[in-house]
């Protein structure tokens, strides 16, 4: 990444398209949910990030290479009754017209009698929606992410059974203080009671339907996190995600 422009703009918390390239680490992670190389584990001889091209490139069709952005799916379809299926997703009632991969398997409503098939690890996502709003919209949120990952997700529960969705107050890292930046125009002493600007949500992947219909399922959350980062790079996320992490051995009550 030769550009001084990009050196100045990297890691300032905002995606600058001119720097949104592999050479510039996707603007230092600003375009990729803070993940500087989503393809780090991809051992293909191809530069798989350059092959998101609406055609199948088998050398990139592995979990580590993010399943070639699911471009190798033979029967890639869109959900026929999308509005209906969105409204009835994960409502504890099986709608067979929504029980397909493209419709998110009705949020597993038709698979309640099947054993769960959890991917190893936890997805930890920061999203710029306060917890109450995110929880209110959780079915749509989980459906949107599930559509990108071609599987089902659920909010993790802590040891007391509470949903692991926590208020997020923003970062006070050096990166966020670049160019003397402060998130608010208030003096430091007034920043003690910062307002909630988002949520940190802990998610699990349940592959119980994915493994029946596909061989492109995430065995762990690392590649799933990387795929979300890849969607961020492409600008195809429908929610204001800020960061994504994968924790393969996560504590149940971590905040």
């Amino acid at each position: 990444c030769q550009s001084q422009y990009c050196a100045d703009k990297a890691r300032d918390g905002i995606c600058d398209e001119a720097c949104n390239s592999h050479a510039c680490q996707w603007d230092g992670g600003d375009c990729s949910l803070t993940m500087e190389d989503p393809w780090a584990n991809c051992t293909s001889t191809l530069r798989c990030w350059e092959y998101i091209n609406n055609q199948c490139d088998e050398q990139c069709n592995t979990a580590e290479c993010l399943f070639d952005n699911f471009e190798c799916q033979r029967n890639s379809k869109t959900c026929k009754y999308d509005k209906y299926c969105a409204d009835h997703f994960k409502d504890n009632h099986c709608d067979q017209g929504c029980n397909s991969e493209e419709c998110g398997w009705d949020g597993l409503d038709c698979a309640s009698d099947q054993p769960e098939n959890l991917a190893e690890g936890t997805l930890i996502i920061v999203v710029l929606l306060p917890p109450e709003q995110l929880l209110q919209d959780s079915r749509s949120f989980l459906r949107a992410l599930g559509t990108l990952l071609h599987t089902n997700l659920r909010i993790k529960q802590d040891s007391q059974g509470a949903l692991m969705v926590y208020p997020y107050f923003g970062e006070k890292s050096a990166a966020m203080k670049k160019q003397k930046m402060t998130r608010r125009s208030l003096p430091e002493e007034q920043e003690q009671e910062q307002e909630v600007i988002g949520s940190k949500i802990f998610l699990e992947i349940d592959n119980r339907q994915c493994v029946q219909d596909s061989d492109q399922c995430f065995k762990n959350t690392d590649a799933a996190a990387a795929l979300l980062a890849s969607h961020a790079i492409q600008g195809t996320l429908s929610y204001p995600l800020v960061s994504v992490f994968s924790e393969l051995e996560s504590p149940r009550n971590a905040q």
């Epitope: 300032d12 600058d16 398209e17 710029l128 970062e171 160019q179 204001p240 800020v242």
Partner: antibody, heavy 122, light 107 residues
Framework: EVQLVESGGGLVQPGGSLRLSCAAS????????MSWVRQAPGKGLEWVSY????????YYADSVKGRFTISADTSKNTAYLQMNSLRAEDTAVYYC???????????????WGQGTLVTVSS | DIQMTQSPSSLSASVGDRVTITCRAS??????LAWYQQKPGKAPKLLIY???IRASGVPSRFSGSGSGTDFTLTISSLQPEDFATYYC?????????FGQGTKVEIK
């Protein structure tokens, strides 16, 4: 309904200061970037400054760098433009405009305020 | 800075005419180009983004095309409410820059 309302414009002498406000409503303020764009009387549009409220990242046009400061208060859903050392050539209608992409600076401005007039004259 | 040059600066047309406005960037802006419409005394309104995608609520008679350095805004059949000034804007590299505007007047 997404809405932006500017205020704070007025008449100021050269060398003086003014602070413009842009009150946002109808969306999650911290999720979207905000720019100030100005238009001198009878002239075209000129981008002035940008802020991403979540991270505080700021960008400026060379013509205002060192004189203008953009900021945001996420608790008030308001963006500000502090204008110091004002010059006659800063006379313009100032618009605040929301960028359409969540965390992407490289996005078009999809919602605009009605504008506030700043006149710099002795 | 990237210079944006619009042509023509002004044009006269009649209702029902097909109108084409061009915008040229001094270097590639890929497809990161927007078109705005502005009427006297009003704020600009987003018409087209990403060079060719119509913004929400924009009539289908407006279309955009191009990538790299050369872009076009076309109004397929001019309506009375379309008489206004049109600006292109690149949002690829900051500072974001606008064209000088094209005023569409009634013939």
């Amino acid at each position: 309904e997404v809405q932006l309302v500017e205020s704070g414009g007025g008449l100021v002498q050269p060398g003086g200061s003014l602070r413009l406000s842009c009150a946002a409503s109808g969306y999650t303020f911290s999720s979207y970037g905000m720019s100030w764009v100005r238009q001198a009387p009878g002239k075209g549009l000129e981008w002035v400054s940008y802020i991403y409220p979540y991270s505080g990242a700021t960008y400026y046009a060379d013509s205002v760098k060192g004189r203008f400061t953009i900021s945001a208060d996420t608790s008030k859903n308001t963006a500000y433009l502090q204008m110091n050392s004002l010059r006659a050539e800063d006379t313009a209608v100032y618009y605040c405009a929301r960028h359409s992409g969540y965390y992407r600076i490289s996005s078009a401005m999809d919602v605009w305020g009605q504008g506030t007039l700043v006149t710099v004259s002795s | 800075d990237i210079q944006m040059t619009q042509s023509p600066s002004s044009l006269s047309a009649s209702v029902g005419d097909r109108v084409t406005i061009t915008c040229r960037a001094s270097q590639s802006v890929r497809s990161f180009l927007a078109w705005y419409q502005q009427k006297p005394g009003k704020a600009p309104k987003l018409l087209i983004y990403r060079a060719s995608i119509r913004a929400s609520g924009v009539p289908s008679r407006f279309s955009g095309s191009g990538s790299g350095t050369d872009f076009t805004l076309t109004i397929s059949s001019l309506q009375p409410e379309d008489f206004a000034t049109y600006y292109c804007q690149q949002y690829y590299i900051s500072p974001w820059t606008f064209g000088q505007g094209t005023k569409v007047e009634i013939k």
